[in-house]
C-alpha cells in the first residue's frame, strides 16, 4: 500500500511526514553548484513524489530536482546565491511540504583529501597534512576542519583538533609508542557561509616508533 | 516591521562619486539579503545591486557593473552603495530593499534622490 494517494486524491498523502533535508555545494563542478535534498523518513514511498526548488534563481522560475535512488538532486549555475529559495516536495502539481532555504547556509563542503603523516626523528612529531578543492574555489574558502585521530584498539577513543590550516604537529610524546593510530579529516564551512560538516577524508594509518630504553625516548 | 532609511543622495556632477547608505531596523538583517535599486523620472524600478547575508556573494545589473559597488556592515545593520563614474544616466531615486525571500523583496525604504548634472 503506497503512503501517498492515487487517482488524485490526495487525503492520504497528506497524512504522511514529508520531512526534508537538503544540502548545497558550491563550484562543485566548476562554475556549477549542486543541491541534495532527502526525506527524514528512510521509509517514506517516494514514487510519484517529486522536488522543486523556485525563486531566488537566474533566468528561471523554478527547477525540478533529478531523482537518484532515495536522494533529489540538481546541478547548476543558476542559483543566485542572494536571499531564499522555495524547496517543495510535490506530487503532481500539488506542493506537499515547503522549506525556504538560503542556499549559502546550507553548504556542506567537499571532503578533504591527500591525508599524510610524516615522521620527524629529529624534532620528534608527526607533521600531519591535508589538502582540500576549497583553497581554489571563489566562493566556500574560509573553513575549519576536524582531524580526529586515534589508536587503532581504542574504538569510540578519537582525539579532535579543530584548525583552520591544512598543516598540524602532533608532538610524540602525546602519543603511545609502537601504536598503529588511524586519523581522519572533515571540513565545515568558518566564514561567510554556514552549513554542516563535510564527509570524512579516507583514513590514514601510520606507526609511532618504540621507545628506546637507553634514552627513554622512542625509537 | 521592519524600516529602512536610505541616506547620502545628492547633486554631483558627471563623473563624480557618491556614496550611499541604508539602515535598517530589522532584527534579521544579518541573515537578510539586501538590495538597491533606482527609479528614473517616469520609469519603472529598475534592479542594480544585491548582496547576501553575509557579503561574499554580490550581483549587479549589466547598467552598472564595474562602476557601482555594494558592500554591507552587520555590526550596524547597514548596506552600502559605493557609485563612482556618474552618468546623467544615473539621476534618480534610489531606494533599498531588504529580504529576498522567492523572487520578492519584502521590505523597502522611502528612497534618496540622487542627480547627475551634466
Known amino acids: 500500500e503506497s503512503g501517498y494517494a492515487q487517482n488524485g486524491d490526495l487525503e492520504d498523502a497528506e497524512l504522511d511526514d514529508y520531512s526534508f533535508s537538503c544540502y548545497s555545494q558550491l563550484e562543485v563542478n566548476g562554475s556549477q553548484h549542486s543541491l541534495t535534498c532527502a526525506f527524514e523518513d528512510p521509509d517514506v514511498n517516494t514514487t510519484n513524489l517529486e522536488f522543486e526548488i523556485c525563486g531566488a534563481l537566474v533566468e528561471v522560475k523554478c527547477l525540478n530536482f533529478r531523482k537518484l535512488q532515495e536522494i533529489y538532486f540538481i546541478e547548476t549555475k543558476k542559483f543566485l546565491l542572494i536571499g531564499k529559495s522555495n524547496i517543495c516536495v510535490k506530487v503532481g502539481e500539488k506542493s506537499l511540504t515547503c522549506k525556504k532555504i538560503d542556499l549559502t547556509t546550507i553548504v556542506k563542503p567537499e571532503a578533504p583529501f591527500d591525508l599524510s603523516v610524516i615522521y620527524r626523528e629529529g624534532a620528534n612529531d608527526f607533521v600531519v597534512t591535508f589538502n582540500t578543492s576549497h583553497l581554489q574555489k571563489k566562493y566556500v574558502k574560509v573553513l575549519m576542519h576536524d582531524v580526529a585521530y586515534r589508536q587503532e584498539k581504542d574504538e569510540n577513543k578519537w582525539t579532535h583538533v579543530n584548525l583552520s590550516s591544512t598543516k598540524l604537529t602532533l608532538l610524540q610524546r602525546k602519543l603511545q609508542p609502537a601504536a598503529m593510530y588511524e586519523i581522519k579529516v572533515r571540513s565545515i564551512p568558518d566564514h561567510y557561509f554556514k552549513g554542516f560538516w563535510s564527509e570524512w577524508s579516507p583514513s590514514y594509518y601510520f606507526r609511532t616508533p618504540e621507545i628506546n630504553n637507553s634514552s627513554g625516548e622512542m625509537d | 516591521e521592519v524600516q529602512l532609511v536610505e541616506s547620502g543622495g545628492g547633486l554631483v556632477q558627471a563623473g563624480g562619486s557618491l556614496r550611499l547608505s541604508c539602515e535598517s531596523s530589522g532584527s534579521t538583517f544579518s541573515s537578510d539579503a539586501m538590495g538597491w535599486f533606482r527609479q528614473a523620472p517616469g520609469k519603472e524600478r529598475e534592479f542594480l545591486a544585491a548582496i547576501g547575508w553575509s557579503g561574499a556573494v554580490t550581483h549587479y545589473s549589466d547598467s552598472v557593473q564595474g562602476r557601482f559597488t555594494i558592500s554591507r556592515d552587520n555590526a550596524k545593520n547597514t548596506v552600502y552603495l559605493q557609485m563612482n563614474s556618474l552618468k546623467s544616466e544615473d539621476t534618480g531615486r534610489y531606494y533599498c530593499?531588504?529580504?529576498?525571500?522567492?523572487?520578492?523583496?519584502?521590505?523597502w525604504g522611502q528612497g534618496t534622490q540622487v542627480t547627475v548634472s551634466s
Open positions: 530593499a531588504e529580504d529576498y525571500d522567492t523572487d520578492v523583496w519584502q521590505y
